[in-house]
Interface confidence: low
Amino acid sequence: SAPGEDEECGRVRDFVAKLANNTHQHVFDDLRGSVSLSWVGDSTGVILVLTTFHVPLVIMTFGQSKLYRSEDYGKNFKDITDLINNTFIRTEFGMAIGPENSGKVVLTAEVSGGSRGGRIFRSSDFAKNFVQTDLPFHPLTQMMYSPQNSDYLLALSTENGLWVSKNFGGKWEEIHKAVCLAKWGSDNTIFFTTYANGSCKADLGALELWRTSDLGKSFKTIGVKIYSFGLGGRFLFASVMADKDTTRRIHVSTDQGDTWSMAQLPSVGQEQFYSILAANDDMVFMHVDEPGDTGFGTIFTSDDRGIVYSKSLDRHLYTTTGGETDFTNVTSLRGVYITSVLSEDNSIQTMITFDQGGRWTHLRKPENSECDATAKNKNECSLHIHASYSISQKLNVPMAPLSEPNAVGIVIAHGSVGDAISVMVPDVYISDDGGYSWTKMLEGPHYYTILDSGGIIVAIEHSSRPINVIKFSTDEGQCWQTYTFTRDPIYFTGLASEPGARSMNISIWGFTESFLTSQWVSYTIDFKDILERNCEEKDYTIWLAHSTDPEDYEDGCILGYKEQFLRLRKSSVCQNGRDYVVTKQPSICLCSLEDFLCDFGYYRPENDSKCVEQPELKGHDLEFCLYGREEHLTTNGYRKIPGDKCQGGVNPVREVKDLKKKCTSNFLSPEKQNSKSN
C-alpha cells in the first residue's frame, strides 16, 4: 500500500478542530507582483514581507512595493510601508538582515536617475522603526554585515568603490577605488581584489588581493596576479595566474594572507574553474573542473592545512562556472555528503559519502520501491536524488534535499529508483539514519519542511492547479494526515517556516487570481495543539549513528569516534520544544585504515581501503611547496582525515622534511608583501 495508508497508521486525535483553531489567514491588500520574506532574529517571531510589482499583462505603470511586518510568526501582518515613506524597494538587493539577534535590517530603495547616490532604510529594533539615509554612492551589491560586529557594513558602488560604515549605515567612507570583490573575514577583516588598468573583467588574472584589518585605515597587499579568491572555514583561497601561460593555481593561507602555500591541486585553464564545495575549520572539499566542456570534474579533499589534497570523487557533476552541482552537506549527520556523478554513458547517478569524502557509494535501494526503466537488472538498482541540477533542468522537482542539524538522521529528497536519475515524475524519499537507508515517503513531487526538530514533517503536493490541502506526519514520514486549510484553493508559491526547524508554525504562501487583480495570501498553521504535551525521557530512545554492523566492536566509528544520540521515538506525539538540544554521547575509536585519507601521490581503488601509488608519480620524489620552502614527503600513502579523533590502532608512517630549498609559486612571497596606510 502507499505510504501512510496501511492499518498501522494511528490517526492523530481531533486534529482537524485543533488545526482549524490555529489556522490564520492574511490577505495582502495589494496587487500580486513578487514577494520576499525574511525572518528577523531567532525565536523573535518577527517576519518582514516585501511585495513588489511591476506587472505586464495587467494595467500598471509604476513599480510599487509594500512592506509588512509580523511579530507572531506570520499569523498577523501589519502594513508598515509608511515607515519607509512608501518608497519602492529594490528587490534584487533583498532585505539585508543583521547577524545573530542584532535586530538590524537594511532595505535599499530605488532612486531616480539623476540622484547623487542611493538611499537605504535602516532599522535596529527588529523593523519597528526605520531611519532613511541617503548614500554618497549608488550601491552595486547588498550591504554586507561584519559577522563580528553588526554595526560594521560594507558595500560596493556602481563605480567599483569599496565603501564602509562603522555606525550601521549612518555615515559611509570610501576606503578604496577599483574594487572587484570584497568579503568580510574574521575579526572585522576585509579582503578585496582591485584592478589597476581597465576593469575587473579586463584585469581578471591580474588583480591584486588586499586586506585591511582596521576598516580602511591601513592596507596590505597580500597577493598579485589574482583571478579570484574565496573564504571557507579558516582557509583563505586565491586562484593565481601562472607566470608562463594562461593556467591558474589555487594558493591557500591559514593566517589571513600573511603566508601562502600552493595547494597540491591540478592547475586549470581559461575555460576551467575551481569551486569550494564545502569547508569547515578542519578541511575543504574542492571541485576542480575537467578541461573541455565536459560538465564534470574531480572532488579533492584537503588536509588540515588545506595544502595537500586527495582525490575523493571522479566525474563529479558540475556544469559550468557558477553553474549547477548537486553537492549537498547532509547536516543531520556528521560526515555525510551527497552529490551526483556523470557516468560514461552520460547518465547521472547519485553518490553518498559517510566519512567526509573518504569513500563514496551508491544510495541503497528503498525497500518499498521497484527499480524503474533505467535499471538493467530489475532487482539491483539504487536511489538517485534530485538536487540543484535537476531543478535547473526544469524537471518536476520543486525542492532540493532537506536536512536539519537538530533533526538528527533525517534527510528528505526527491528521487528515482534505478541505475541513474530519471526524467520521470519523481517521488519523495526519507532517510531516518543519515542516508544509509531510505523509504518512499510520498508519491509524486512535494514541497516539504521539518518542524519541531523533526517532531513534525509538513508537505504540500506540487501542482499547477490551486491547492487547499496540507499533509503532515508526526512519525518521521511513515504515516500522513491531510488537513484542508482553506475552502477556496490558492495558487501555491511556497512554504515558509522559521530557519532552524525549531518552530511549530508553518506559513503557506500563494495567491488568488483574476485577470486584473491578483492578491498574495498566507495561511499560518500552528501545530502546537497537535503535539499537546512536552516530550519526556520515556519518549526518547538511544540511537547509534553510522551503525551498520551491531556485532562489530567498531560499529558506528566514523572519523575516529562514534556517537550515540537520544532520539524521539516515532510513536511519541509530543513537543521537542524550541529549547530542544540534541543529546549525544561521543566515544573514541581505535584507528584503522578508514581513518586515513590517501596521501599526496596516492589514491584508493574503488572498494578498497588500501592506498596505492598514483602510476604517474611512481618512483618520483614527493616534493611540494610550503610557505615558500620545498618540502619532501616521506609517506606510505596515508594521512589522518582532518577532524578524525581516533587513537591507537593502525599508525601509518608520515614525515615531512624541510629540503631547505627555496621555491616560489608566482605569488608574492611574504617578504615582498607591502603595506600602506591611508
Partner: antibody, heavy 124, light 106 residues
Framework: QVQLVQSGAEVKKPGSSVKVSCKAS????????ISWVRQAPGQGLEWMGG????????QYAQKFQGRVTITADESTSTAYMELSSLRSEDTAVYYC?????????????????WGQGTTVTVSS | DIQMTQSPSTLSASVGDRVTITCRAS??????LAWYQQKPGKAPKLLIY???SLESGVPSRFSGSGSGTEFTLTISSLQPDDFATYYC????????FGGGTKVEIK
C-alpha cells in the same frame, strides 16, 4: 516541446462572427497566458487580447473591447478567440501565441511559441 | 495605450553588415520589451525578451539593449537568413507592437 495548433481558414460575411481555436500540446496549458495577435495583409502585428487559462479571466486591447471574446477550455487545452460584427478590414491572419509566465508572479518571457496562423477572410 | 515607434521602417543592408533597429516607447516601459523576427507567410519568432535576454536557440549575433523608452536590436553580422521583418513589442500594460522594420538585401 509545446505546440499550438490552430483551426483552419474561414471565409465570413460582413456582420457575422468567427471563432478560431488554438489547441496546446506538450506542456502545462493552465500556467501560461495565451495572447491573440492578428496581421492584416501587408500590415504589422496587432495584439487583440489575452487569457490565462488557469484563471479564465481575459484582457482585451481597447480597439477590440466589446467585439472580441477570448475563452479557454482547460480540459482540452484549447483557447478560443471569437470576433463579432466582422467587417472587411478584419481580413487577416490570426495567431495565438504562448506568453511565458512564472507561477507566483509575472515574469515576462515574450511570446515564445506561436500557432501556425488562421486566415480569416471577410467578404460579401 | 503605450505607442511603440520603430525606425527605420525599411533598411537595406548586405551580408556581414552590422544592423541596428531602434524602438521608442511613448512612456517608460522599464525592460518589458521583446523583439521578433517574421518571414513572409510564417509566424513571428521570439528573438529577445526582457529587452536584452536572448531566447534559447537564437544565434548570438542578435542582441538587445535599452530600458525605459529607448531600445535597440543589433545584428552584429547580417547573415542571408536574417533578411526578414523585425517587430518590437512592449508588455508594460496592454501589449502593443511596433510598426516593423523590413531588412532587405542592398
Amino acid at each position: 516541446q509545446v505546440q499550438l495548433v490552430q483551426s483552419g481558414a474561414e471565409v465570413k460575411k460582413p456582420g457575422s462572427s468567427v471563432k478560431v481555436s488554438c489547441k496546446a500540446s506538450g506542456g502545462t496549458f493552465s500556467s501560461y497566458a495565451i495572447s491573440w495577435v492578428r496581421q492584416a495583409p501587408g500590415q504589422g502585428l496587432e495584439w487583440m487580447g489575452g487569457i490565462i487559462p488557469g484563471f479564465g479571466t481575459a484582457q482585451y486591447a481597447q480597439k477590440f473591447q466589446g467585439r472580441v471574446t477570448i475563452t479557454a477550455d482547460e480540459s482540452t487545452s484549447t483557447a478560443y478567440m471569437e470576433l463579432s460584427s466582422l467587417r472587411s478590414e478584419d481580413t487577416a491572419v490570426y495567431y495565438c501565441a504562448r506568453q511565458g509566465r512564472k507561477t507566483g508572479y509575472y515574469y515576462y518571457y515574450g511570446m515564445d511559441v506561436w500557432g501556425q496562423g488562421t486566415t480569416v477572410t471577410v467578404s460579401s | 495605450d503605450i505607442q511603440m515607434t520603430q525606425s527605420p521602417s525599411t533598411l537595406s543592408a548586405s551580408v556581414g553588415d552590422r544592423v541596428t533597429i531602434t524602438c521608442r516607447a511613448s512612456q517608460s516601459i522599464s525592460s518589458w520589451l521583446a523583439w521578433y523576427q517574421q518571414k513572409p507567410g510564417k509566424a513571428p519568432k521570439l528573438l529577445i525578451y526582457k529587452a536584452s535576454s536572448l531566447e534559447s536557440g537564437v544565434p548570438s549575433r542578435f542582441s538587445g539593449s535599452g530600458s525605459g523608452t529607448e531600445f535597440t536590436l543589433t545584428i552584429s553580422s547580417l547573415q542571408p537568413d536574417d533578411f526578414a521583418t523585425y517587430y518590437c513589442q512592449q508588455a508594460d500594460g496592454h501589449i502593443t507592437f511596433g510598426g516593423g522594420t523590413k531588412v532587405e538585401i542592398k
